[in-house]
């Protein structure tokens, strides 16, 4: 086995090119200089290396950078990123959004892997907060990203970043998360008026207190049932029948189809039957 550690005559790699796909694993180990690999990482993706060969290339980089890869190398990892462990990634210092995008692109179409989760965590912690451009990027790749964060993590989202959030990004958020995001959305959109404001704030109303719902009920907003069903039960319960009727407008008829589901079910039970009857929907308290 000893002779395999020396590079055969004439096989020393001068550059990273397609000829290397014919190298055995031990030849790659012996004949490819790690520093050369690091400077020509951008070429690796264009070459159809096997997984075993990629393991060798990763090993060479690991030896060259035992404390973690520099960003100049990380940005060009491409498919080699899939070979990285969360432990490897924790050694990195990724500060460029371009680097983040390049690596997320490699994992595109797949569930968020532990590697990607670690990468994002490192990136966000390095930046100190989840700024708008980062949030834009992350939600583009992973629409559920925002709702994967804890309320504590969400508290570091600056209100200005809320402009990047699309309704579908909030689909899987629970009430505790929306409790954190709602005041940020109110701050972000506070200079908007009328229906424009309501359209923007609507997705965040799952974090709204009763007082805000009461105020909206007096302003002809015609909230749709999908939004109403996502409201906090404790925020809906104090609303009167008249307030719910005004809040939903023409959508009030949809209450009948939802009468067995929260928060509608719990709200119905709190109302006087005489009041419910004024809706003419046959709701039974």
């Amino acid at each position: 086995e000893v002779e395999k550690t020396a590079c055969p005559s004439g096989k020393k790699a001068r550059e990273i090119d397609e000829s290397l796909i014919f190298y055995k694993k031990w030849e790659l180990e012996a004949c490819v200089d790690a520093a050369l690999l690091a400077t020509q990482m951008d070429r690796v993706n264009a070459i159809p290396f096997t997984y075993e060969q990629l393991d060798v290339l990763k090993h060479k980089l690991d030896e060259l950078y035992p404390q973690g890869y520099p960003e100049s190398v990380i940005q060009h990892l491409g498919y080699l990123f899939l070979k990285m462990s969360p432990e490897d990634i924790r050694k990195w210092n990724v500060t460029s959004l371009e680097t983040l995008k390049a690596l997320l692109e490699v994992n595109k179409g797949h569930e968020m892997s532990p590697q990607v989760a670690t990468l994002i965590d490192r990136f966000v912690k390095g930046r100190g907060q989840l700024d708008k451009d980062t949030l834009d990027t992350l939600t583009a790749f992973y629409p559920g990203y925002l709702c994967s964060l804890s309320p504590e993590e969400l508290s570091s989202v600056p209100p200005s970043s809320i402009w990047a959030v699309r309704p579908q990004d909030l689909d899987t958020c629970d009430p505790r998360q929306l409790d954190v995001l709602y005041p940020k959305a109110r701050l972000a959109f506070q200079n908007m008026n009328g229906s424009e404001y309501f359209v923007k704030i609507q997705s965040f109303l799952g974090g709204a207190p009763t007082e805000d719902l009461k105020a909206l009920s007096q302003q002809n907003v015609s909230m749709d049932l999908a939004t109403f069903m996502k409201l906090r039960t404790d925020a809906v319960l104090p609303l009167t029948v008249a307030e719910v009727q005004k809040l939903l407008g023409p959508h009030v008829e949809g209450l009948k189809a939802e009468e067995r589901h929260r928060p509608v079910r719990d709200w119905i039970l709190r109302q006087r039957q005489d009041d419910l009857d004024t809706l003419g929907l046959g709701l039974q308290g």
Partner: nanobody, 131 residues
Amino acid sequence: QVQLVESGGGSVQAGGSLRLSCAASGNLYNNMCMGWFRQAPGKEREGVASIYIGGGYTNYADSVKGRFTISPISRDNAKSTLYLQMNSLKPEDTAMYYCAAVSIALTREFCAPIVSRYNYWGQGTQVTVSS
């Protein structure tokens, strides 16, 4: 949630002046309204003056126009303060004065000082004007 605490009330002779203050804590946003209301013994609560926090709108009851001035919110760290400057006071201005807020106003006009629209209220401060 918004907490409102009024101060500055007291007794004054007709023709005198008072300045009421309302210290607001909690989340205040530009698209909220704040206002002053009053309630004389045996009478219903009525609107006095109101303002859209984001600016560009104030509204006064006819009975106080030209005498009372509601000032824009002054912000100082976590505390924000609303003022009502009351000049040329009359005995009929005697009442308990309340500071109130509307948590969301989709339009500035919604800030008109109509009691049923306002959903946060302070405890009130007494103003007595003697002749």
